[in-house]
């Protein structure tokens, strides 16, 4: 799976969309999980309604919400009041039994609120530094990493 980068502004909401084949994943609940390292396990953050027919209902876990357009084939995750610690690698998953298929790998980046000068040194302002090697980042929108592209080096 390629990784898609979503950039949001600290203190604001970030919407992550995960398109999928609605027929292939018909009847399957979906989930949003946080990956603990590129090769690590993915910890469930929130999942869609227990009744698949009610997947359109928004479910919250803390500041994270999930809703599923099962006909259109789009899973949407909302991260409210985005904070630096929300940065990281996530997955959109399609659940079947105890198994989970990855719909999309997502890298969430947190950018500074340009209107908030209190923590100006604490967050990355777009254009201040390049976060990727050999890659152009279009700020505040998503993009896919190229095949085999590594966004950052592995680290703890």
């Amino acid at each position: 799976h390629n990784t898609t980068v979503f950039q949001g502004v600290a203190g604001q909401s970030l919407q992550v969309s995960c398109p999928y084949d609605s027929m292939k994943h018909w009847g399957r609940r979906k989930a949003w999980c946080r990956q603990l390292g590129e090769k690590g396990p993915c910890q469930r953050v929130v999942s869609t309604h227990n009744l698949w027919l009610l997947s359109f209902l928004r479910r919250w876990n803390g500041s994270t919400a999930i809703t599923d357009d099962t006909l259109g084939g789009t899973l949407t995750i909302t991260l409210r009041n985005l904070q630096p610690h929300d940065a990281g690698l996530y997955q959109c998953q399609s659940l079947h039994g105890s198994e989970a298929d990855t719909l999309r790998k997502v890298l969430v980046e947190v950018l500074a609120d340009p209107l908030d000068h209190r923590d100006a040194g604490d967050l990355w302002f777009p254009g201040e530094s390049e976060s990727f090697e050999d890659a152009h980042v279009e700020h505040s929108i998503s993009r896919s990493l190229l095949e085999g592209e590594i966004p950052f080096p592995p680290t703890s």
């Epitope: 390292g37 690590g40 703890s156």
Partner: antibody, heavy 120, light 107 residues
Framework: QVQLVQSGAEVKKPGASVKVSCKAS????????IHWVRQAPGQGLEWMGW????????KYAPKFQGRVTITADTSTSTAYMELSSLRSEDTAVYYC?????????????WGQGTLVTVSS | DIQMTQSPSSLSASVGDRVTITCHAS??????LSWYQQKPGKAPKLLIY???NLHTGVPSRFSGSGSGTDFTLTISSLQPEDFATYYC?????????FGQGTKVEIK
């Protein structure tokens, strides 16, 4: 028991090469990134590079590019670091280090270190 | 390369003291910072990952904070086994780089 066991101390002459091994037990190296970090006597830590044993991809610090080769043999769960054209300033303890990569790895294992002495 | 600058380079403290070590990155590194503890003749041990997350088995007297370019490691009440050298390490970009280390000695 999860551990990384490194090969023994080496004494080499300037210009020679050294190959240090790092054998994993209790886990599969394909599930980890293997890094090499060195520490000269009385000095700090210096990252040399890493390998993804599953893919065979490796990445090196510019300082060591062209002199270091990191490889892995998944059949024996062993990683290797070879440093060529040795000079006296390469005298250091070399550590292998396994983790799950970027974005909050909760796994972190280190070898016991291998002292490489370069002396004429 | 991203330069990591730790301060102080060494400090003397007593058991029970509150100790603070800072690490400054020359570029923005978001929260991709780890703190390691190393004792003489031993391999480093991970204390904190992702700037503020305590690694498994690490005592709660250790804490990390910060994001962007400035980070802090705090030991709330220094214990005898905490006398060691501490390193920060960034994981924002290649190559990984460490701070020069902070040696915590007995006063």
């Amino acid at each position: 028991q999860v551990q990384l066991v490194q090969s023994g101390a080496e004494v080499k002459k300037p210009g020679a090469s050294v190959k240090v091994s790092c054998k994993a037990s209790g886990f599969s190296i394909e599930d980890f990134y293997i890094h090499w970090v060195r520490q000269a006597p009385g000095q700090g830590l210096e990252w040399m590079g890493w390998i993804d044993p599953e893919q065979g991809d490796s990445k090196y610090a510019p300082k060591f590019q062209g002199r270091v080769t990191i490889t892995a043999d998944t059949s024996t769960s062993t990683a290797y670091m070879e440093l060529s054209s040795l000079r006296s300033e390469d005298t250091a303890v070399y550590y292998c280090h396994a983790d799950h990569g970027n974005y909050g790895s909760t796994m972190d294992y280190w070898g016991q270190g291998t002292l490489v002495t370069v002396s004429s | 390369d991203i330069q990591m600058t730790q301060s102080p380079s060494s400090l003397s403290a007593s058991v029970g003291d509150r100790v603070t070590i800072t690490c400054h990155a020359s570029q923005h590194i978001n929260v991709w910072l780890s703190w390691y503890q190393q004792k003489p003749g031993k391999a480093p041990k991970l204390l904190i990952y992702k700037a503020s997350n305590l690694h498994t088995g690490v005592p709660s007297r250790f804490s990390g904070s910060g994001s962007g370019t400035d980070f802090t490691l705090t030991i709330s009440s220094l214990q005898p086994e905490d006398f060691a050298t501490y390193y920060c390490q960034q994981g924002q970009t290649y190559p990984r780089t460490f701070g020069q280390g902070t040696k915590v000695e007995i006063k």
